[in-house]
């Protein structure tokens, strides 16, 4: 495989990682898909300093980021542990609410106006933010 | 100049497999995610697939999902459509076209037909 | 899956006036929504992404507008080589999925 070792046009460079910042909403898994298609994933955030400079980014909009509990226990979708990693839940949070009335409980992780996170229904066309990291190998299979 | 040119479409027997390929110059491959669209004669656009730009991720729509497979070689510039157990309804013209951000497909090739029939 | 309805399915004009289509998506794709143009025999091609930005190199004849569900693409003043079929696709979620086609063609 190849390594890259720029980021892509529109995408902003931080700590070895690329990052892009949409800007129209999608679904959380949607917006999952979005982030492979690019060949990257949406942003896992390992600590604050990571936390702040997304947050800058993004302003005061809720922004999907690649944490849920779809499955059951909480998970970054890049396989970074959740139970040791960085956190930054808004108070009583994450509650997995069902009094919002769309069915089921609340899923999804994002960034509220304040940067802080918040769980909720993973339908919401939300904004959300891939990542990938420089110096990564790409998996290029190899053609049958 | 970017372009995109498909080939290896013809006439094929219901149960039998073709492979299409799409040979892109113009721009960098790598980094582009890359899709088939195939119109029935006389009918409109189907989305049939979507390959990331290292080939890591894919897509299908329901209707060819586990009997076709999307690639690629980076090396070569060329994106591949395998096309196994093929029916009467695959029939088409085949254009692999180009994904940019927006998912929409900015550049289109003249595309090929695929003839399914006994 | 999502689907994208356009009307008319056909319109006939002249050169010179001015031609709307709709298209409805089933459920909300916020803005993800493009136009396409195709002419008889020959490759679609792209107009106009994100439900009102035009492509590089199209004529400002061509716009688009709509948010949620429903969307119009508007060609202000038809030109020759405006008779055509036009496709919406939406862009929000997988499978990708275009409306049926609108054919625009001479009165």
């Known amino acids: 495989g190849s390594e890259r070792t720029c980021c892509p046009v529109n995408w902003v460079e931080h700590e070895r990682s690329c990052y892009w910042f949409s800007r129209s909403g999608k679904a959380w898994a949607d917006a999952d898909n979005y982030c492979r298609l690019e060949d990257a994933h949406l942003v896992v955030v390992t600590s604050w300093e990571e936390q702040k400079f997304v947050q800058h980014h993004i302003g005061p909009v809720n922004t999907w980021m690649g944490l849920h509990d779809q499955n059951g226990p909480w998970k970054w979708v890049d396989g970074t542990d959740y139970e040791t990693g960085f956190k930054n839940w808004r108070p009583e949070q994450p509650d997995d609410w069902y009094g919002h009335g769309l069915g089921g409980g609340e899923d999804c992780a994002h960034f509220t106006d304040d940067g802080r996170w918040n769980d909720d229904v993973c339908q919401r066309p939300y904004r959300w933010v891939c990542e990938t990291e420089l110096d990564k190998a790409s998996q290029e299979p190899p053609l049958l | 100049e970017v372009q995109l040119l498909e080939s290896g479409g013809g006439l094929v027997q219901p149960g039998g497999s073709l492979r299409l390929s799409c040979a892109a110059s113009g721009f960098t491959f790598s980094s582009c995610a890359m899709n088939w669209v195939r119109q029935a004669p006389g009918k409109g656009l189907e989305w049939v697939s979507a390959?990331?730009?290292?080939?890591?991720?894919?897509f299908y729509a329901d209707s060819v999902k586990g009997r076709f497979t999307i690639s690629r070689d980076n090396s070569k510039n060329t994106l591949y459509l395998q096309m196994n157990s093929l029916r009467a309804e695959d029939t088409a013209v085949y254009y692999c076209?180009?994904?940019?951000?927006?998912?929409?497909?900015?550049?289109w090739g003249q595309g090929t037909m695929v003839t399914v029939s006994s | 899956d999502i689907q994208m309805t356009q009307s008319p399915s056909s319109v006939s004009a002249s050169v010179g006036d001015r031609v709307t289509i709709t298209c409805r998506a089933s459920q909300g794709i916020t803005s993800w929504l493009t136009w396409y143009q195709q002419r008889p025999g020959k490759a679609p091609k792209l107009l106009i992404y994100?439900?009102?930005s035009l492509q590089s190199g199209v004529p400002s004849r061509f716009s688009g507008s709509g948010s949620g569900t429903d969307f119009i693409f508007t060609i202000s003043s038809l030109q020759p080589e405006d008779f055509a079929t036009y496709y919406c696709?939406?862009?929000?979620?997988?499978?990708?999925?275009f409306g049926q086609g609108t054919k625009v063609d001479i009165k």
């Open positions: 076209a180009k994904r940019t951000p927006y998912d929409v497909f900015d550049i």
């Open positions: 390959i990331s730009g290292s080939g890591g991720s894919s």
């Open positions: 696709q939406q862009g929000n979620s997988f499978p990708f999925t």
């Open positions: 994100d439900t009102s």
